[in-house]
């Protein structure tokens, strides 16, 4: 055994990392809210829109207290991976009417990807179990019409907004347990 290769620099403490993850999640939440408002302005929603392939909302705010750190991070990562896949699909197959949401939709995708990497790094640093994401779901079928793409966009942005809102609350609560 030889000497260590010089004094290592301190990387962010997992608690500080959780802080920056919360900030990133909040920023993504604001982006999503803004993009959803932009979509509503251009294409008003006629009621609620659902998409069967989207994950169900992980948890009600009231039930957050019982959560454990690994469960929150694992579920959040799985749900955000699904939303990332849906945003990629929307950009690829959403049709010309949704091109008006660029470059904001591209920025949203990049930030979502960054948040996912941050969550995985946090789980690694804490040495929490990291179950693999669910096996890839079958490819999403292209929307049947331009209006189908718009309805899908309403559902995706609405669901992502709720998930990120839940994520911020969950992460802040977990910080108190670290």
């Amino acid at each position: 055994p030889g000497p260590p290769p010089g004094p290592p620099r301190v990387s962010p403490d997992p608690r500080a990392e959780l802080d920056s993850t919360v900030l990133l999640t909040r920023s993504l939440l604001a982006d999503t809210r803004q993009l959803a408002a932009q979509l509503r302005d251009k294409f008003p929603a006629d009621g609620d829109h659902n998409l069967d392939s989207l994950p169900t909302l992980a948890m009600s705010a009231g039930a957050l207290g019982a959560l454990q750190l690994p469960g929150v991070l694992t579920r959040l990562r799985a749900d955000l991976l699904s939303y990332l896949r849906h945003v990629q699909w929307l950009r690829r197959a959403g049709g010309s009417s949704l091109k008006t949401l660029e470059p904001e939709l591209g920025t949203l995708q990049a930030r979502l990807d960054r948040l996912l990497r941050r969550l995985q790094l946090l789980m690694s640093r804490l040495a929490l179990p990291q179950p693999p994401p669910d096996p890839p779901a079958p490819p999403l079928a292209p929307p049947s019409s331009a209006w189908g793409g718009i309805r899908a966009a309403h559902a995706i942005l609405g669901g992502l907004h709720l998930t990120l809102d839940w994520a911020v609350r969950g992460l802040l609560l977990l910080k108190t347990r670290l």
């Epitope: 990387s11 690994p70 804490l126 040495a127």
Partner: antibody
Framework: EVQLLESGGGLVQPGGSLRLSCAAS????????MHWVRQAPGKGLEWVAV????????YYADSVKGRFTISRDNSKNTLYLQMNSLRAEDTAVYYC???????WGQGTLVTVSS | QSVLTQPPSASGTPGQRVTISCSGS?????????VHWYQQLPGTAPKLLIY???ERPSGVPDRFSGSKSGTSASLAISGLRSEDEADYYC???????????FGGGTKLTVL
Amino acid sequence: EVQLLESGGGLVQPGGSLRLSCAASGFTFSSYGMHWVRQAPGKGLEWVAVISYDGSYKYYADSVKGRFTISRDNSKNTLYLQMNSLRAEDTAVYYCAAGVPDYWGQGTLVTVSS
Amino acid sequence: QSVLTQPPSASGTPGQRVTISCSGSSSNIWSGYDVHWYQQLPGTAPKLLIYSNEERPSGVPDRFSGSKSGTSASLAISGLRSEDEADYYCAAWDSSLYGPVFGGGTKLTVL
């Protein structure tokens, strides 16, 4: 400055036991998962065991399962590896590592030989 | 037999750019787990060089860069220097082990 100092290595006969310790300083030990990684002479790195930041999760490489036990004492900023039923193929430099791993100790040599 | 596959050796002349590859399986890189890279200079402990596929810890020169695409990852070293001569290891979380796995290591020689 981050420091991880391993101790407890040495020469032991096959079938014998050793307990390695790793004293941590310069970072919030209780917020990091900790690993033991080993390197046989002239060979590559092999992950041995990991323990979560709070000690609630412990996982082992198949090659040491049932023989080695990882533990930690957050009040003492110390990581341990209890090694039983040692074999010649366990001969290696054992590194204690924190996080990803982000930080590594200088290693302690364990030699299993009769 | 390492779970992640790396070429055993690589070489280049000073100033050149060298790339080291790392491929995995369905329980690690293919499952979307991030890849980390370590440098081990002769006679020393490993040092984290790249984390989360492409991030550099503070103090690591920007000559070192990482990338990941689908089933494999790579480490690129540009403007090669004699002090870069070392062993380089990739690592990723493996869901079947519930721990990290390492590549077999690549010995980089600066000619």
